[in-house]
């Protein structure tokens, strides 16, 4: 499947340019910034989305304790280098020849260096912890209802099989969604947990990446779930390599 044929748009990525110039006059969409063709029946990779974002006009207790190796995306936005499949290249550099290694979700996992820095492989992020705080409600949400709704959301909106939603933890007002996906588990066609988490993050922030769809209206048994804070932790298959200097 490619883009929506009727009006030639990309339902899963509004940061695209679409035209009916594919084989047999089919609608084909290309990501802004990279010009790469995207599959509009699934989520676009985070690397291509970040690249498109950077090219766009600028105005446009039961809880889990993240491990010592968990990464938080403190560096924010940058214009990434993506490989031909749309994945992050292991080494990223800026215009001033400062380079660093990233994981599969594009988060820096080493100290910054110069052009001599080597990043041998793209290390996979296999565990993502999405930490949410919801606005006060009349009462706590029912845990199993919350679990069911979030799993449904990730399946139906982000196309992530529920087997990759390892757990949903809840201690009012904190909700934690654990996404896990080992290399061996991920089959061809499976959405990457990093991409699902990025789409979810943007939805929560009211910056939906979907074409022409209303923003995310999260409800648990009809009760609105409004998020006031989001923190995302990334755990890689190989722990990150930072100098002690960074940790003090």
């Amino acid at each position: 499947h490619t883009a929506a044929q009727d009006n030639c748009t990309c339902p899963t990525n509004k940061m695209t340019v679409c035209s009916p110039d594919g084989p047999g006059g089919r609608c084909q969409c290309r990501a802004l910034g990279s010009g790469m063709a995207v599959d509009c029946s699934t989520l676009t990779s985070k690397c291509l989305l970040l690249k498109a974002r950077m090219s766009a006009p600028k105005n446009a207790r039961t809880l889990v304790r993240p491990s010592e190796h968990a990464l938080v995306d403190n560096d924010g936005l940058y214009d990434p280098d993506c490989d031909p499949e749309g994945r992050f290249k292991a080494r990223q550099c800026n215009q001033t020849s400062v380079c660093w290694c990233v994981n599969s979700v594009g988060v820096r996992r080493t100290d910054k260096g110069d052009l001599s820095l080597r990043c041998d492989e793209l290390v996979r992020t296999h565990h993502i912890l999405i930490d949410l705080r919801h606005r006060p409600t009349a009462g706590a949400f029912n845990h199993s209802d919350l679990d069911a709704e979030l799993r449904r959301l990730f399946r139906e909106r982000y196309r992530l099989h529920p087997k990759f939603v390892a757990a949903v933890h809840y201690e009012q007002p904190t909700i934690q969604i654990e996404l896990r996906q080992n290399t061996s588990q991920k089959a061809a066609g499976d959405v990457d947990i990093g991409d699902a988490a990025y789409y979810f993050e943007r939805d929560i922030k009211g910056e939906s990446l979907f074409q022409g769809r209303g923003g995310l209206d999260l409800r648990v048994r009809g009760e609105p779930l409004q998020v006031e804070r989001t923190l995302i932790y990334y755990l890689d298959e190989i722990p990150p390599k930072f100098s002690m200097k960074r940790l003090t």
Epitope: S41, E149, R152, E156, R157, R159, E178
Partner: antibody, heavy 119, light 111 residues
Framework: QVQLVQSGAEVKKPGASVKVSCKAS????????INWVRQAPGQGLEWMGV????????SYNQKFKGRVTMTRDTSTSTVYMELSSLRSEDTAVYYC????????????WGQGTLVTVSS | DIQMTQSPSSLSASVGDRVTITCRVS??????????MHWYQQKPGKAPKLLIY???NLESGVPSRFSGSGSGTDFTFTISSLQPEDIATYYC?????????FGGGTKLEIK
């Protein structure tokens, strides 16, 4: 309450096509994907595929690839399953079934549509 | 494809009996402690009805005499005290991997 109502029984000749409908009500149609399962007389259940009511695309059991097409009409909250190049072995009751919330279980089923393929 | 071996294919029991059906899967359907195994009841001429989801969770409105257990590749479905209305065919199903597959069914009869 959630309901899936299917179209009536069909009798078809070998080589023909059949299109079965499944009308959903009692919930937000685009919130849940719809599966199709068939059951030949006196036999077990066989999963044919699933359609995303949100996106409109489908994933099919390889066994039926090229012969089955699943579509949806959000304006009428209806899902369709079309099976082509019918043969006698396709004689079965065809069910639509909604995904449940969290674990891809099928929580609501249509009443079934008997499709008879006979010359 | 994941193969499902359900046994027995048929069984006869008396009202009040404890009935057990097993389902063995060709590969694990466990993902981080979540088992993508479900059980359905089908009465003659009717659509299947979900009884148990995620191996051991009772679907809303289903009597508590029905239960499920197991993980990985071996699963069990139990009726603690058989009732006349339980006469039906029971199926296990995995939704871990596409194509989703069902067990061959167990036809339950009253002695």
């Amino acid at each position: 309450q959630v309901q899936l109502v299917q179209s009536g029984a069909e009798v078809k000749k070998p080589g023909a096509s059949v299109k079965v409908s499944c009308k959903a009500s009692g919930y937000t149609f685009t919130d849940y994907s719809i599966n199709w399962v068939r059951q030949a007389p006196g036999q077990g259940l066989e999963w044919m595929g699933v359609i995303s009511t949100y996106y409109g695309d489908a994933s099919y059991n390889q066994k039926f690839k090229g012969r089955v097409t699943m579509t949806r009409d959000t304006s009428t909250s209806t899902v369709y399953m079309e099976l082509s190049s019918l043969r006698s072995e396709d004689t079965a009751v065809y069910y639509c079934a909604r995904y449940g919330d969290g674990y891809n279980q099928f929580d609501y089923w249509g009443q079934g549509t008997l499709v008879t393929v006979s010359s | 494809d994941i193969q499902m071996t359900q046994s027995p294919s048929s069984l006869s029991a008396s009202v009040g009996d404890r009935v057990t059906i097993t389902c063995r899967v060709s590969e694990s359907v466990d993902s981080y402690g979540n088992n993508f195994m479900h059980w359905y009841q089908q009465k003659p001429g009717k659509a299947p009805k979900l009884l148990i989801y995620r191996a051991s969770n009772l679907e809303s409105g289903v009597p508590s005499r029905f239960s499920g257990s197991g993980s990985g590749t071996d699963f069990t479905f139990t009726i603690s005290s058989l009732q006349p209305e339980d006469i039906a065919t029971y199926y296990c199903q995995q939704s871990y991997e596409d194509p989703y597959t069902f067990g061959g069914g167990t036809k339950l009869e009253i002695k």
